[in-house]
């Protein structure tokens, strides 16, 4: 049985302030079951950016329909980017549990924010 992979194809993305940023992430398998979450930064102080399971993330929308049972694309779009959004974003697969257990992280995508053209 092949090991599940979390694929973040872009190492870096550059976006102008005020625009939207698309952060791509796909998984190689839907099993084992468990949620995908997006974080900015790594380690214990990382910031939760998006979690399909629960929570309200008004600036974040999934690129693909996450309610499709065969969905393997967990890319997100973040609107109205500001310099404060700069950082490295990680797509993380969890295995179900109490609590859910981190299984594998993508390599990360560094988001840089350019000044808005005048």
């Amino acid at each position: 049985e092949e090991e599940l992979q979390v694929i973040q194809p872009e190492k870096s993305v550059s976006v102008a302030a005020g625009d939207s940023a698309t952060l791509n992430c796909t998984v190689s398998s839907l099993i084992p079951v468990g949620p995908i979450q997006w974080f900015r930064g790594a380690g214990p102080g990382r910031e939760l950016i998006y979690n399909l399971k629960e929570g309200h993330f008004p600036r974040v929308t999934p690129v693909s329909d996450p309610t499709k049972r065969n969905n393997m694309d967990f890319s997100i779009r973040i609107s109205n980017i500001t310099p404060a959004d700069a950082g490295t974003y990680y797509c993380v697969k969890f295995r179900k549990g109490s609590p859910d257990v981190e299984l594998k992280s993508g390599a990360g995508t560094e988001l840089s924010v350019r000044a808005k053209p005048s």
């Epitope: 079951v33 949620p35 309610t67 049972r69 065969n70 179900k96």
Partner: antibody, heavy 118, light 108 residues
Framework: EVQLVESGGGVVQPGGSLRLSCAAS????????MSWVRQAPGKGLEWVAG????????YYPASVKGRFTISRDNSKNTLYLQMNSLRAEDTAVYYC???????????WGQGTLVTVSS | SYELTQPPSVSVSPGQTARITCSGG??????YAWYQQKPGQAPVTLIY???KRPSNIPERFSGSSSGTTVTLTISGVQAEDEADYYC???????????FGGGTKLTVL
């Protein structure tokens, strides 16, 4: 308050057709996957169809595949189940149910009775 | 026939603890839920995602999982808990929603 109200049940002859409706309110219908679950008299629950939030992807068990079609109109907040080539064993109360992020059911309608009899 | 297996009946005295088990699904590809149904009524969701309880459900209802078996525990059973209880699942390997055959809980 989440509300799901089914309609369209009735008596139909074997080989006949029927379309059930489920009117949804109290939540963002277009963001949730939905399903139909039935219960034959004195029997247990049986899932018969599921549909993604956008309506592009549908799912069925072998028992109804090719005879039942689930669809939705997000502009009307309504879920449908088109049932063709009905058989006596399709006699049941049909419930519509809202799906959670991982395709379990959190809210149920009150059900509508379908009787297939000559 | 039902893909998930649960006992047809369980009896318990008021105030005691009732446990209903459900098995048959692969741990790695299944999520489980528990539904309560009283005669002539629609099902009500008691537990989802194996052990999560909706906010409107009393704390005496809890879910747990161990390997391929999940358990619904009702602590301090009350007369109003007499009902049919269904184990339901989502199977990611087949994109289907199997159910157990139901367990009739009798409060003695």
């Amino acid at each position: 308050e989440v509300q799901l109200v089914e309609s369209g049940g009735g008596v139909v002859q074997p080989g006949g057709s029927l379309r059930l409706s489920c009117a949804a309110s109290g939540f963002t219908f277009s963001s949730n996957a939905m399903s139909w679950v039935r219960q034959a008299p004195g029997k247990g629950l049986e899932w018969v169809a599921g549909i993604s939030a956008g309506g592009s992807d549908t799912y069925y068990p072998a028992s109804v595949k090719g005879r039942f079609t689930i669809s939705r109109d997000n502009s009307k907040n309504t879920l449908y189940l088109q049932m063709n080539s009905l058989r006596a064993e399709d006699t049941a109360v049909y419930y519509c149910a809202r799906e959670t992020w991982n395709h379990l059911f959190d809210y149920w309608g009150q059900g509508t009775l379908v009787t297939v009899s000559s | 026939s039902y893909e998930l297996t649960q006992p047809p009946s369980v009896s318990v005295s008021p105030g005691q603890t009732a446990r209903i088990t459900c098995s048959g699904g692969s741990y790695s590809s299944y999520y489980y839920a528990w539904y309560q149904q009283k005669p002539g009524q629609a099902p009500v969701t008691l537990i989802y995602s194996d052990d999560k309880r909706p906010s409107n459900i009393p704390e005496r209802f809890s879910g747990s999982s161990s390997g391929t078996t999940v358990t619904l525990t009702i602590s301090g059973v009350q007369a109003e808990d007499e009902a049919d209880y269904y184990c339901g699942g989502y199977d990611q390997s087949s994109y289907t929603n199997p159910f157990g055959g139901g367990t009739k809980l009798t409060v003695l």
